[in-house]
């Protein structure tokens, strides 16, 4: 049987809405023939299900086998190193992978200008893997909130922050002209999920966008 292989030092999930990735760190001094076995346990069904016998990557997309995450008690995963006939002990994720572990994101942010206001529309994520009935707004049906960060370009990177409770928002520019850049971070007030800031979207506001009224 030879010397025992060391176990992967760390195993954890990183996830966005219907994008569930298991990660692990490699064993020290792994050889070119070292690979990793991945198994999954669904809470309530107390048996481990082998997902991959020999993955040579250090991450594995488990979305397809965890599609019921948002209607379940969650999962644990475990990984072990395999090299020929030798294998290590399992390393198990040290937290339950549940809906609480999903990082919230937005699909995109669209900006337009009307009467000196910046009007924003937040597009929610629409992942291809999601079952038809499992939309972001049906799973997170209440208390959706969005932190809005605005900066004026050129500027000294001081942000104006605002929290909104709808996917549509408006920002008053106080008659200023220039380029305004907006980022959005979603949250759900009743949940503890982390949120990821969106990429910045920018829009230029010039005098032509202001309506003159007597």
């Amino acid at each position: 049987h030879g010397t025992e292989l060391p176990s992967p030092p760390s195993v954890w999930f990183e996830a966005e809405f219907f994008h569930h990735i298991l990660h692990w760190t490699p064993i020290p001094n792994q050889s070119e023939s070292t690979c990793y076995e991945v198994a999954l346990l669904r809470y309530g069904i107390e048996s481990w299900n082998s997902i991959s016998n020999c993955s040579q990557t250090l991450s594995y997309d488990l979305t397809a086998v965890t599609l019921d995450l948002y209607h379940s008690n969650g999962y644990r995963a475990r990984v072990r190193a395999v090299d020929g006939s030798r294998h290590s002990n399992w390393t198990v994720t040290n937290t339950r992978f549940s809906v609480d572990e999903v990082t919230l994101t937005v699909g995109s942010v669209n900006l337009e200008i009307h009467n000196g206001f910046i009007l924003g529309k937040i597009q929610l994520p629409r992942p291809k893997m999601a079952p038809a009935n499992d939309t972001y707004e049906s799973i997170f049906s209440h208390f959706r909130e969005y932190e809005i960060a605005i900066r004026k370009v050129p500027g000294n990177f001081t942000f104006t922050h605002k929290k909104v409770k709808h996917e549509n928002f408006s920002l008053l520019t106080s008659g200023e002209v220039g380029e305004f850049c907006v980022q959005v971070k979603p949250s759900v007030a009743s949940r503890s999920n982390k949120g990821m800031w969106s990429k910045e979207e920018c829009i230029s506001l010039t005098r032509q966008y202001f309506t003159v009224t007597n």
Epitope: P9, S10, W12, E14, A15, E16, H19, H20, I21, H23, T25, T57, L58, S59, T103, A149, F157, F159, H161, Q183, K185, K194, G195, M196, W197, K199
Partner: nanobody
């Protein structure tokens, strides 16, 4: 907007050491992890090392294993790369990047924010 600013590059003799730093600024810092990539003159950008931002877990390219050490200071939003036993083939521009996708730590595509880079030259 997240800004990443690398520092610590310079000219060093073979066998010498350098410590690179990357300061993340801007109130909108959020990332799964952070990484270092490098681009040697006339070559493509390659993965060097990465670290989880919350929790334990580090990755290294085979070419730097045992010589480079990645670390972080969450309270300062700062990433480090301690580079020992430097070789001529380590000469490159080193880029710090923030991982904003749950996909692989080793892939450039997982990183949504990049610094401007700092030059490391290893020469006698």
């Amino acid at each position: 907007q997240l800004q990443l600013l690398e520092s610590g590059g310079g000219l060093v003799q073979p066998g010498g050491s350098l410590r690179l730093s990357c300061a993340a600024s801007g109130r909108t810092f959020s990332a799964y992890g952070m990484g270092w990539f490098r681009q040697a003159p006339g070559k493509g950008r390659e993965f060097v090392s990465a670290i989880r931002w919350f929790g334990e877990g580090t990755y290294y390219a085979e070419s730097v294993k045992g010589r480079f050490t990645i670390s972080k200071d969450n309270s300062k939003n700062t990433l480090y790369l301690q580079m020992n036993s430097l070789r001529a083939e380590d000469t490159a521009v080193y880029y710090c990047a923030a991982k904003t996708s749950p996909t692989s730590y080793l892939s450039e595509k997982s990183y949504g924010y990049w610094g401007q880079g700092t030059m490391v030259t290893v020469s006698s």
